[in-house]
Interface confidence: medium
């Protein structure tokens, strides 16, 4: 349990301490106060090291101290002989004594006081980001006009979220442009237009100074564009480092702007635009486009149709052509809908014959139809090869669409016959 | 057959098996079976196997029975009331249209039919083979298949054979030119129960092949001269007969 | 006049394995079927296998099946069984014999004993 | 398989009987059958094949007669020469089988 003071004697006193003694003693005073630690009295047997017998002061895994002979005070006016001061609310006092003594020593006597600590200046690390405040057993922070203290009661930043951009065209700033931005916040904007328009960013690189990176390469204060799961940046430093016209593919853009304690720059101002969704020219394979154009944007509309020896199967039903919407989601609509080969199926088996597993039933696929040799053989000819045509069937350069005949090889025994010798 | 060889169904796979009457066939394509007509003109719905070198019941089970649609003999061929007192056998041929189409392979592959050009006209000398399970020196009927080569020979040859078992005057059994006479060499003959077996001539035109240039029809005495059915002599009533009578998918 | 002679018998470990030869003569040997055939001591006969002419058709017992093998070499008139994994049980005289007439087995040879013992 | 049934599986007759071994077929084996002779210390030896049909050399004292599941093989007239192990043996499905064999003595 903490308590507010102590006293500390070695074993006996003030009679002579006993051979082969090893004590310990552990302090603790409330949190938020230091301990203030000192000797009255102190008659240890003396030795190099202090290693015969010796008391040693530890706080955490640092030895403070530790001692051994007789000590007396510098200053008539106080008794204390040695004393320390932590500014931890724990401490570790061990008394050894080892096997023989040549005099008789009377050991040691010590007392504890709780001590107020300054969190705002005793440390190396500040505590507060802006002001810090202290009071017997802590401190709190505080934060100056326009700023709020974050949820870990250390940071104070500026409240600067929440705005929505919906309008077609604008502007956006971090917080006191051109003056430098807040220190320690995070400010995150929304731009939210009509579906079917993609936000398109447009900078100046000369609208940009934000704190640069690290050694490391990692931004300290930095600019982010998020637009579903695509991410542009972070950025930062002097002068904008990405493109200058960043096209989000989408109607909703998140803007972070994240800075740390340090380093305030004049931040940042950029434009926005919503722009017709543009869906890709693609490169759809074995069709033609109608109208051909150099660029498609929301709402247009286009007709596939197939090149020779290809079909769109949509369901079960083979067509030609199909049409396709430019959506506002920057997709083509019917894009599942491909020019695919035509697809002959499976060839139809025969009698007495097989037909290898085609590696591929499309158009322009070749496969080969085999008798069951040695006992059947191809009677119609054509030598079996057939072709995928454009009409899904399967063709053969003599017989067309009609399938090889495996008829019987005749009066050939498998085995010639040896007849009896006489 | 007599004065023959063991032999196995791979050195045959054309031969069929009737078991009644105990008799030969010939295999000449997947709905077909060729035969001599007086095989079948006594039961026209006869049981057929291929496939097997051995006719035991066991070994039988185990292979390929083959069932027929129709039996088509010969016009020519003329019915008696009395066949055992038979003396002409001209005309000695029929076709078995079967059922279902057979499935080829090592034991089971038809024979050809002969070429209509001369090439297909035989020479005394020439050698054929012939097979089955009929009498053999030993026994009424062989148990395993067995066969033996023997020369074409001239006509007269069988007629000068005296007939064992007579069943009407010498002079009163036919010779034509529809019937080839072979054997007379080391006691080599076809038997009863070999009728209907193919006499199998290596194709001049092809001799990795053989074709069926007779059928074992009748003999005045076993061991001596036999006479084959001369298939080439019927070749044009086989196709019609064929063709008449086949599926569209045959066709 | 036809002899089978048999050889390649003797005292084997179990597990282990023997071949052994048929020396055929006094007939073309091409043109028959051959059998094996054994004997245990003091039992009666027991066909353990059948080889074709050409040597395209065996059939084996069930209780050697898998472990022996039938073989022919008609250039050299002989006939060979192979035994492999042997066991106590396979202990007989074995005896190779012609296959004549549909299956009866016309001539026999002396007969050659194996032992299977550890 | 086909199971062959011989009996008695030993007899003892005096010279010039009439000697009766009977073998029965677990199955119709038609007369896919075969009766063999072994003397002591030697190799069997083919005596009549097909139930009933005599091999060539062999003395007509030895008959045999029988079909379907049933066969008897018959010596008409008991010689001392004849003292051996008789056994049938089927030949209508692989695997050949054996009868167990009849010992016939002389008293």
């Known amino acids: 349990e903490p308590t507010m003071y102590g006293e500390i004697l070695s074993p006996n006193y003030p009679q002579a301490y006993p051979s082969e003694v090893e004590k310990s003693w552990d302090i603790e005073v409330p949190e938020g106060y230091g301990i203030h630690l000192y000797f009255t009295h102190l008659d240890i047997e003396l030795s190099e090291n202090c290693a015969y017998d010796s008391v040693q002061i530890i706080s955490g895994d640092t030895e403070e101290g530790r001692l051994c002979g007789q000590r007396s005070s510098n200053n008539p006016h106080s008794p204390i002989v040695e004393e320390f001061q932590v500014p931890y609310n724990k401490l570790q006092v061990i008394f050894k004594s080892d096997f023989s003594n040549e005099e008789r020593f009377t050991g040691f006597a010590a007392y504890y006081v709780a001590t107020d600590i300054n969190e705002c200046t005793d440390f190396v690390d500040v505590p507060c980001s802006h002001f810090c405040n202290n009071f017997i057993g802590g401190y709190f922070c505080s934060c100056p006009p326009e700023y709020f203290l974050h949820d870990d009661m250390k940071n104070c930043g500026v409240n600067c979220s929440g705005d929505v951009f919906t309008a077609l065209i604008g502007e956006i700033a971090s917080p006191n442009y051109p003056k430098p931005y807040p220190e320690n916040s995070r400010c995150e904007y929304q731009i939210r237009l009509e579906k079917g328009f993609q936000v398109v960013v447009t900078l100046r690189r000369e609208d940009f100074d934000v704190e640069a990176a690290d050694s490391a390469g990692n931004c300290l204060d930095s600019l982010v564009f998020v637009a579903g799961d695509r991410q542009f940046g972070p950025y930062c430093g002097h002068g904008f480092p990405g493109p200058l016209n960043i096209e989000t593919k989408s109607n909703a853009l998140d803007i972070i702007f994240q800075t740390d304690l340090t380093g305030q720059k004049k931040g940042w101002k950029l434009r926005y635009h919503g722009d017709p969704m543009p869906c890709p020219k693609e490169d759809t394979p074995n069709s033609v486009w109608e109208p051909a154009k150099a660029k498609y944007v929301f709402r247009d509309v286009v007709q596939i149709t197939c090149l020779d020896g290809f079909e769109v199967v949509e369901g079960r039903v083979g067509a030609t052509s199909f049409y396709s919407t430019c959506q506002s989601n920057g997709k083509w609509s019917n894009s599942k809908l491909k020019c695919q080969p035509v697809d002959c199926g499976i060839p139809e088996s025969i009698e007495n014959g097989k037909v290898e597993d085609p590696e591929s039933t499309l158009f322009g696929s070749v496969i080969r139809y085999t008798c069951e040799e040695p006992y059947y053989y191809m009677e119609n000819g054509g030598g079996g090869e057939y072709h995928c045509a454009g009409n899904g069937s399967w063709v053969n350069e003599v017989l067309g669409p009609e399938l090889p005949k495996c008829v019987p090889v005749c009066g050939v025994p498998r085995e010639p016959f040896e007849e009896k010798q006489r | 057959i007599i004065g023959g060889s063991d032999a196995d169904i791979k050195n045959f796979p054309w031969q069929v098996f009737f078991d009644n009457p105990w008799a030969g066939g010939a295999l000449i394509n997947e709905y077909w079976v060729l035969t001599a007509a007086h095989v079948v003109e006594g039961n026209r719905e006869p049981t057929m196997y291929v496939g097997s070198t051995s006719v035991q019941t066991s070994r039988l089970a185990k292979s390929k029975m083959l069932t027929p649609e129709h039996v088509f003999i010969h016009p020519g061929w003329k019915l008696l009331e009395v066949p055992e007192g038979r003396t002409n056998f001209d005309n000695d041929i029929a076709l078995v249209r079967l059922k279902d189409p057979v499935k080829m392979g090592p034991t089971v592959s038809p024979i050809c039919l002969p070429g209509t050009s001369s090439d297909y006209n035989l020479m005394d000398g020439d050698l054929g083979l012939i097979s089955g399970w009929g009498r053999t020196e030993k026994r009424d009927r062989a148990v395993r298949l067995k066969a033996a080569r023997l020369p074409v020979a001239p006509l007269r040859k069988c007629k000068e054979v005296k007939v064992e078992k007579p069943t009407a005057d010498a002079e009163a059994y036919v010779f034509t030119p529809n019937m080839i006479c072979a054997g007379g060499e080391k006691g080599m003959d076809s038997c009863k129960g070999d009728s209907g077996g193919a006499f199998a001539v290596q194709d001049p035109n092809d001799k990795t092949k053989f074709y069926a240039a007779g059928l074992v029809s009748w003999g005045p005495q076993c061991g001596t001269y036999g006479l084959y059915t001369r298939v080439k002599n019927y070749v044009d009533w086989i196709m019609k007969t064929m063709q008449e009578n086949s599926t569209p998918r045959e066709d | 006049q036809v002899q089978l002679v048999e050889s390649g018998g003797g005292l084997v470990k179990p597990g282990g394995s023997l071949r052994l030869s048929c020396a055929a003569s006094?007939?073309?040997?091409?043109?028959?079927?051959m059998s094996w055939i054994r004997q245990a001591p003091g039992k009666g006969l027991e066909w353990v296998s059948y080889i074709s002419r050409s040597g395209s058709t065996k059939y084996y017992a069930d209780s050697v099946k898998g472990r022996f093998t039938i073989s022919r070499d008609n250039a050299k008139n002989s006939l060979y069984l192979q035994m492999n994994s042997l066991r106590a049980e396979d202990t007989a005289v074995y005896y190779c014999a012609r296959d004549q007439e549909d299956y009866a087995l016309d001539y026999w040879g002396q007969g050659t004993l194996v032992t299977v013992s550890s | 398989d086909i199971q062959m049934t011989q009996s008695p599986s030993s007899l003892s007759a005096s010279v010039g009987d009439r000697v009766t071994i009977t073998c029965q077929a677990s199955q119709d084996i038609s007369n896919y059958l075969n009766w063999y002779q072994q003397k002591p210390g030697k190799a069997p030896k083919l005596l009549i094949y097909d139930a009933s049909n005599l091999e060539t050399g062999v003395p007509s004292r030895f008959s045999g007669s029988g079909s379907g599941t049933d066969f008897t093989f018959t010596i008409s007239s008991l010689q001392p020469e004849d003292i051996a192990t008789y056994y049938c043996?089927?030949?209508?499905?692989?695997?050949?089988?054996f009868g167990g064999g009849t010992k016939v003595e002389i008293k």
């Open positions: 043996e089927q030949y209508e499905d692989y695997p050949l089988t």
């Open positions: 006094g007939f073309t040997f091409s043109d028959y079927y």
